[in-house]
């Protein structure tokens, strides 16, 4: 997955940091404070979108070749930017009950970008 | 069974240098920030470096900036620490140790920890 | 950088005795306090995080209280293994991460 450079419009990985504070999350949230979630952002032509390294899947990209050559259902479909490997990341927060918990939640950090 | 394994200590000359390794197993190894900590004879323990799950955060002991070098491999389960222009007082166990938080882009603490590898720095 | 300071440096205890170790802060680090338990040629072994949460595998009887600049650790009832040197360890600002100087529990 590419990395948004500011030169390129085609579809990257963009860092962004989400503060907890920000969103009003602080309060049950005990850490981090922080993180970077980053976003997907950035065009999907055909000749990318049909790439199988820039695709989300495997499924994506044959869809795609459909797509490229105008078959039916799939030619007016457009490719969209999103995030084809995320992280998990561990946080501290208070449940109901004030306890602290520890905690690994999936799919928390977008890590690599492709053309679904 | 999550385990570490350091190795690469020994008896090694002031000035000279040493390189040591960690060997990860039974966890996710890419998911986790490393460090490294030691122990001199009959002392506490002094946290030297660590290095955060892609390598993005990197930090060192006073004691030892400029000096030493950490990195990691994931793609090898490794924890590596380069140390350079070796003192009398780098002499202590050196640990190896698993960060408790998944992913942070900074330290919080240790849950699992290796045996340690000796480095003894004389002339 | 966050100095550490546990209190006391040693001290004596029975089998059964309800002991407090205490550690200090040199600035307010909310609750990002750990603490940890070493015996003799052994690795050191995550007790608490959180200030007062318990790792698991650890007995009950091990618990930690405190917040922003005072903490402590306390053992209820103690067991003839608990007999070592215990750490604090401050994770609010770092690097550096900090330990305190320890505290060497040992049988009266």
């Known amino acids: 997955g590419l990395e948004c450079d500011g030169k390129v419009n085609i579809c990257c990985k963009k860092q962004f940091f989400v503060s907890f504070k920000d969103i009003g999350w602080n309060d049950w949230i005990i850490a981090p404070s922080g993180y970077h979630a980053n976003y997907c952002e950035g065009e999907c032509p055909s000749h990318i979108a049909g790439t199988s390294g820039s695709s989300l899947s495997f499924h994506s990209t044959v869809i795609n070749h459909y797509r490229m050559r105008g078959h039916s259902p799939f030619a007016n479909l457009k490719s969209c930017c999103v995030p084809t490997k995320l992280r998990p990341m561990s946080m501290l927060y208070y449940d109901d009950g004030q306890n602290i918990i520890k905690k690994d939640i999936q799919n928390m950090i977008v890590e690599e970008c492709g053309c679904s | 069974e999550v385990q570490l394994v350091e190795s690469g200590g020994g008896l090694v000359q002031p000035g000279r240098s040493l390189r040591l390794s960690c060997a990860a197993s039974g966890f996710t190894f890419d998911d986790y920030a490393m460090h490294w900590v030691r122990q001199a004879p009959g002392k506490g323990l002094e946290w030297v470096s660590g290095?955060?799950?892609?390598?993005?955060?990197?930090g060192y002991a006073d004691s030892v900036k400029g000096r030493f070098t950490i990195s990691r491999d994931n793609a090898k389960n490794s924890l590596y620490l380069q140390m350079n222009s070796l003192r009398a007082e780098d002499t202590a166990l050196y640990y190896c140790?698993?960060?408790?938080?998944?992913?942070?882009?900074?330290?919080?603490?240790?849950?699992?920890w290796g045996q340690g590898t000796t480095v003894t720095v004389s002339s | 950088d966050i100095q550490m300071t546990q209190s006391p440096s040693s001290l004596s205890a029975s089998v059964g005795d309800r002991v407090t170790i205490t550690c200090r802060a040199s600035q307010s680090i909310s609750s990002y306090l750990n603490w940890y338990q070493q015996k003799p040629g052994k690795a050191p072994k995550l007790l608490i995080y959180?200030?007062?949460s318990l790792q698991s595998g650890v007995p009950s009887r091990f618990s930690g209280s405190g917040s922003g600049t005072d903490f402590t650790l306390t053992i209820s009832s103690l067991q003839p293994e608990d007999f070592a040197t215990y750490y604090c360890q401050q994770s609010y600002s770092t690097p550096p991460i900090t330990f305190g100087q320890g505290t060497r529990l040992e049988i009266k």
């Open positions: 290095i955060s799950w892609n390598s993005g955060s990197i």
């Open positions: 140790a698993k960060d408790i938080m998944g992913n942070w882009d900074y330290f919080y603490g240790m849950d699992v």
């Open positions: 959180a200030a007062s």
